[in-house]
Amino acid sequence: KIDACKRGDVTVKPSHVILLGSTVNITCSLKPRQGCFHYSRRNKLILYKFDRRINFHHGHSLNSQVTGLPLGTTLFVCKLACINSDEIQICGAEIFVGVAPEQPQNLSCIQKGEQGTVACTWERGRDTHLYTEYTLQLSGPKNLTWQKQCKDIYCDYLDFGINLTPESPESNFTAKVTAVNSLGSSSSLPSTFTFLDIVRPLPPWDIRIKFQKASVSRCTLYWRDEGLVLLNRLRYRPSNSRLWNMVNVTKAKGRHDLLDLKPFTEYEFQISSKLHLYKGSWSDWSESLRAQTPEEEPTGMLDVWYMKRHIDYSRQQISLFWKNLSVSEARGKILHYQVTLQELTGGKAMTQNITGHTSWTTVIPRTGNWAVAVSAANSKGSSLPTRINIMNLCEAGLLAPRQVSANSEGMDNILVTWQPPRKDPSAVQEYVVEWRELHPGGDTQVPLNWLRSRPYNVSALISENIKSYICYEIRVYALSGDQGGCSSILGNSKHKAPLSGPHINAITEEKGSILISWNSIPVQEQMGCLLHYRIYWKERDSNSQPQLCEIPYRVSQNSHPINSLQPRVTYVLWMTALTAAGESSHGNEREFCLQGKAN
C-alpha cells in the first residue's frame, strides 16, 4: 500500500507478487463521501503506471486489467480529478514481478584448514527479481544437522561456523541448499563429502633453508604444516626465471632435501599441502622464501687474448685481456684474477692478483719464450688456469687468412668473412676475430674485443660493443700450434657522409711542389670508416672547376704532396673526406702561392 489511502483503496488480484507474464486486475475505489463535491458522476478516477496515465473512469470505482509487466517492481497510483481542481492522490500499490528460483547448481563446500569452518558456495541461477531466502542444510552421521539462512538478495555463500573433525575422517556429511520465494522453491542436488574431501589445508608456514657445511649439494628445506598433511608440492626457481621446478613429496614431515640447486643463485621457494593422495584439494602456495645458495669454486676456463706492442730494440709490451666467466661458471663473486707470467727456458715466473679489471699490461724482454696463465678465484677456490704461449701473432705470412671482408649486417652487427690461408688450411686450429674502435693515434687504451671461431668456419658475426657510425679495425688471426698469421680490414655497422672535412694545418713548399698537412677528423665526426681524402684546389678568383687529387685513406697518414701547381699563382685549397655513404662538407680553405720558377 502506498500513502495513507484515506480517500480510497487500490486492490490487486490475484496478488501483489506475480509470475512474469501473468495478468493482474487493479481496482481503485473511493470511500464514501470522498468524491468530488455534490456530483459523483463528476468523479474522474485516473490510474497511473509510474507517471504515465494508463486508464480513467467516471464514477466511484475503476477496474483495469494489466498485462506485460516487466521483471521488477511497478508502481501504480490512482488519482481523482474534479472540475477546476488539481488531481488528488487516492491510493497506490506496488506489484512485484519475478520468477520462482531455479535449482541452485554446483554446490561445493570447503573448510580452510583443519580448524577452519565449513563454508559452501553455489550458483543461484537467473535472478528471481524477488525477495528470495536461501537455507543451507548440513547433515552428518547419527542424524546431526545444522542449518543456516541467508536473506541477502544475492546470496550464494554461507558459512556454517562449525569445523569437521579429523577424528573420523571417513564420516559422510551432506549439504543441500534450498531457495524459497513467493512463487516457489527449489533445492540443489545434495553434495556429500568427508573431512578429507573438503578440508583445504592452510598453506605451509615458517619456511627455512639450511646448507650443511655451506655446500649447495647439502641443502634441506624445512617448513611447518598442519598435523594431517600427507602430501607436499614444492616449487622453486631462480629469482630471474619464470619457469618453476616442481617436486611432489609424500610424508615429508616438514623437510625435504634438494639436490639440483645451482651455486650462488637466488632462488624463490614455495610449498603447498594436501591431506590425501586423491581426495581434497591443495592448499594455496605458501609465502615465498627467497634465499641465495652458497658459492662453489669456479668451473670452466677464462677466454684469454693478448696484444703485443714493440717498444724498442729490447723491450715489448704485452697486454692481456680476458672475458668474465658466465654466472654459471663463476659460481660465486669473483674476488680476483691470478695472472702468472713465466719465461719458459729460464723458469722465471711472476704472479699477480688483479682485482676489478679484466686486463693487465706489462713490459717484458723481447728475448726468451714467454707464457701466461690466468685463473679466476672466488671465496671457494679458483678456476683451472688458461695457459697461453706468447708468440708473434702475425709472423707466419702463409697462415694469414685471405680475402677478408667486413659488411654491415643489420643494426649494430658486422659480418666478417675470409678465406682460409694458402698454407694447408687443415693446419688451422682456430680463428680469432678481434676488433677495436679505430683511433688514429693507435691508442692502446681502447677496449679490445674478440671471439673465437672453429677452424672450419669462414665467417663470424660480431655484435658485442659495436656502435653505429664508428669505424672498427678488424683483424682475423689464424692460429696453428705456436704460429699465427693475420689479416686486417676496417669495417662499420652503419655509416653516413662525414660531418666535416679535414682541417689543413700547414702547406709547405718543397722543390717546386707543395706538401699539405692536415689534422684528422675527430672520430665522432667521421661517421664510419673513411675510404678516401680529397684535396681540391683552384686559382683564386677563378670560376673554373677545381682540380682534385684523391688519396686512399690510411690511418697514420696526415700529409700529401701535390706537384701540379703553377708558380706565382695564388691557389685556394681545401679537403673533404669520404665514407661509402658519401663526401663530407669542405674543411677549412687555405691560400697558397708557389714561389718557385715556372717550368
Epitope: Q115, G140, N163, T165, P166, E167, S168, P169, L228, L277
Partner: antibody, heavy 116, light 107 residues
Framework: EVLLVESGGGLVKPGGSLRLSCAAS????????MNWVRQAPGKGLEWVSS????????HYADSVRGRFTISRDNAKNSLYLQMNSLRAEDTAVYYC?????????WGQGTLVTVSS | DIQMTQSPSSVSASVGDRVTITCRAS??????LAWYQQKPGKAPKPLIY???SLQSGVPSRFSGSGSGTDFTLTISSLQPEDFATYYC?????????FGGGTKVEIK
C-alpha cells in the same frame, strides 16, 4: 550387532613385546577409523593410537610414539597394536574403539601387565 | 595438545537429583566433545556426541550443551543406575584427550 573383541594381553617383562588384536563384526570395518584406548588400574582413560579406514592416517600419543605400532587388515576385519620396549607404566586395560564423532563402540578390554 | 579439565572430580547426590558436570577445553574445540559413562570393571559407554546429540539407546534424562571451550553434561533426575564415573573427550584434533573424570556417588 556391532561387536569388538580384544585379545593378546598378558604378563610381560619390562623391555618385552606384545601384540594385541581386535576382531570386529556387525559393521563395515573398512569404512571406519579405529582406535586403542587404555586405562591404568584406578586411573582415567588415555587415548593411545588411531588409524584411518585405509591406513593413510596414523596418530600416536607422545607416551607411546616410537614403541607402539598400530595396523589393520580390512580383509580380516582386524585391528592390531604391536607393543615393543614395554615399561611398567604401560600396565593397563587396553580397549579397542570405533570412531564416529567420538568413540561410539568399545570392546570389553584386555589386560596388559608389565612387571619383572 | 588440548587439555580437558573436568569439574567437580566427584559429586554426592541422591536419586531424583539434578546433576551437572562441566568440562573445559584449553582451546576452542567447536562442538566436538563426547561424554562417556563407566562403571567399575566395564568398558566405557558412549552417552553424547557432538556436544549435545544423544547416542541411540541413551535415556533422555541425559543432555549435553556448550561449544567452543565450555561444555556441560546434565542428568535431570538421577536414577540408581546412573551412579558411575563420567568422562568428557575432545574429538576436535589429535592427540585426542580425555578429562580426568567425575565420580557420581550416592549421598
Amino acid at each position: 550387532e556391532v561387536l569388538l573383541v580384544e585379545s593378546g594381553g598378558g604378563l610381560v617383562k619390562p623391555g618385552g613385546s606384545l601384540r594385541l588384536s581386535c576382531a570386529a563384526s556387525g559393521f563395515t570395518f573398512s569404512s571406519y577409523s579405529m582406535n586403542w584406548v587404555r586405562q591404568a588400574p584406578g586411573k582415567g582413560l588415555e587415548w593411545v593410537s588411531s588409524i584411518s579406514s585405509s591406513s593413510d592416517y596414523i596418530h600416536y600419543a607422545d607416551s607411546v610414539r616410537g614403541r607402539f605400532t598400530i595396523s589393520r587388515d580390512n580383509a580380516k576385519n582386524s585391528l592390531y597394536l604391536q607393543m615393543n620396549s614395554l615399561r611398567a607404566e604401560d600396565t593397563a586395560v587396553y580397549y579397542c574403539a570405533r570412531s564416529e564423532l567420538g568413540f561410539d563402540y568399545w570392546g570389553q578390554g584386555t589386560l596388559v601387565t608389565v612387571s619383572s | 595438545d588440548i587439555q580437558m579439565t573436568q569439574s567437580p572430580s566427584s559429586v554426592s547426590a541422591s536419586v531424583g537429583d539434578r546433576v551437572t558436570i562441566t568440562c573445559r577445553a584449553s582451546q576452542g574445540i567447536s562442538i566436538w566433545l563426547a561424554w562417556y559413562q563407566q562403571k567399575p570393571g566395564k568398558a566405557p559407554k558412549p552417552l553424547i556426541y557432538a556436544a549435545s546429540s544423544l547416542q541411540s539407546g541413551v535415556p533422555s534424562r541425559f543432555s549435553g550443551s556448550g561449544s567452543g571451550t565450555d561444555f556441560t553434561l546434565t542428568i535431570s533426575s538421577l536414577q540408581p543406575e546412573d551412579f558411575a564415573t563420567y568422562y568428557c573427550q575432545q574429538a576436535n584434533s589429535f592427540p585426542l584427550t580425555f578429562g580426568g573424570g567425575t565420580k557420581v556417588e550416592i549421598k
